[in-house]
Interface confidence: medium
């Protein structure tokens, strides 16, 4: 039996609270080898899918989505899956965007800290080699 | 490999409280999603509810109140029902993940009879 | 709640045919739908996943496809052993911020002659 595909893990930078206007990136993890990243908005039951995929250390790749700038509509919850050939992994936990109108208050912070859902190191639910080539993957509906 | 296993099915009267176990085995509870579905004989599937592996649970809206389901150790999860019916006479079936749900249990038989 | 709606409710076809299934979304679940085939006295088996991925082990005769609430399960060159019934299942998972649910379509009853 294979090894099963870790669950891939999310993060927003610079944060999960952002001042409408601003921009907010969504990084993605997953190991070594992944050929396509999808973040997954959940209210819309939309996605986006990406081949640039980077590696983010010798263990890890990485996707970056970016939303220029963040509307009202941008709020919500997010996730991430991807495929490593000839498998899709299992979703990511979600994590919560928050768009706040900015105060311009000088004690308050544009954005909280960096925040991240789902560790990368656990099996996701891919006992078996599932098929599922990218090549026949949805038109990418997208996010923004 | 990995397994998922439901306790033993029981004829119990109505209004009796029930708790279903399901044993998984070759894989850790915290890093996956749970459900219970379960099938009336001649009907179709009826999803019952699922508990993340954060611990979070969902219920279809018909189960809500009746029954609970929760990870009671590190390899077992519990389907709990109370006030139940002869409607409630179903295979009920484990099975493991969300989008690749590929893991199932036989299913156990549980019978509300008079 | 989120509803699935499968059509036909049985369908007979001969060995070599096509069969067409199709279930409906009663709101959009993007790729987030699973096909089941079951016989009697089994737990279902997991056919398709995310809309088209083809679950491991099974035969490439299996072909899913549709996104958002319209959805279709097509079995080719029908051979004797596809006479099952079939469900499609909402696997978007649910959330504090959702009440899909994770609903069956009814099921499909294929019946080979």
């Known amino acids: 039996q294979e090894e099963d595909l870790p669950r891939p893990s999310i993060s927003a930078e610079p944060g999960t609270v952002i001042p409408l206007g601003s921009h907010v990136t969504f990084v993605c993890r997953g190991p070594v080898g992944v050929q396509t990243f999808r973040l997954e908005r959940e209210s819309r039951s939309t996605y986006n899918d990406t081949e640039d995929v980077s590696q983010a250390s010798p263990s890890e790749s990485e996707a970056r989505f970016r939303i220029d700038s963040v509307s009202e509509g941008n709020a919500g919850p997010y996730r991430c899956i991807y495929y490593k050939p000839p498998k899709w992994s299992e979703q990511s936990d979600y994590l919560e965007l928050l768009v706040k109108e900015t105060s311009g208050g000088p004690d308050s912070p544009d954005t909280e800290p960096g925040s991240s859902a789902g560790p990368t190191q656990r099996p996701s639910d891919n006992s078996h080699n599932e098929h599922a080539p990218a090549s026949q993957g949805l038109k990418a509906e997208h996010l923004y | 490999s990995s397994s998922v296993e439901e306790s033993e099915g029981r004829l119990v009267t109505p209004g009796t409280p029930l708790t279903l176990t399901c044993t998984v085995s070759?894989?850790?509870?915290?890093?996956?999603?749970m459900g219970w579905v379960r099938q009336a004989p001649g009907e179709g599937l009826e999803w019952i509810g699922t508990t993340s592996n954060d611990g979070s649970t969902y219920y279809a809206s018909w189960a809500k109140g009746r029954f609970t389901i929760s990870k009671t150790s590190s390899t077992t999860v519990d389907l709990m029902m109370t006030s139940l019916t002869t409607e409630d006479t179903a295979t009920y079936f484990c099975?493991?993940?969300?989008?690749?749900?590929?893991?199932w249990g036989p299913g156990t038989l549980v019978t509300i009879s008079s | 709640e989120l509803v699935m709606t499968q059509t036909p409710a049985s369908v007979e076809a001969a060995v070599g045919g096509t069969v067409t299934i199709k279930c409906q979304a009663s709101q959009s679940i993007g790729s987030n739908l699973a096909w089941y085939q079951q016989k009697p006295g089994q737990p279902p088996k997991l056919l398709i996943y995310?809309?088209?991925a083809l679950a491991s082990g099974v035969s490439s005769r299996f072909k899913g496809s549709g996104s958002g609430s319209d959805f279709t399960l097509t079995i080719s060159d029908l051979e004797c052993a596809d006479a099952a019934t079939y469900y499609c299942?909402?696997?978007?998972?649910?959330?504090?911020?959702?009440?899909?649910?994770?609903?069956f379509g009814g099921g499909t009853e294929v019946e080979i002659k």
């Open positions: 099975v493991r993940g969300t989008n690749i749900r590929s893991l």
């Open positions: 070759g894989f850790s509870l915290s890093s996956y999603t």
């Open positions: 299942q909402c696997t978007y998972g649910s959330s504090n911020n959702n009440n899909y649910g994770d609903p």
């Open positions: 995310l809309a088209s």
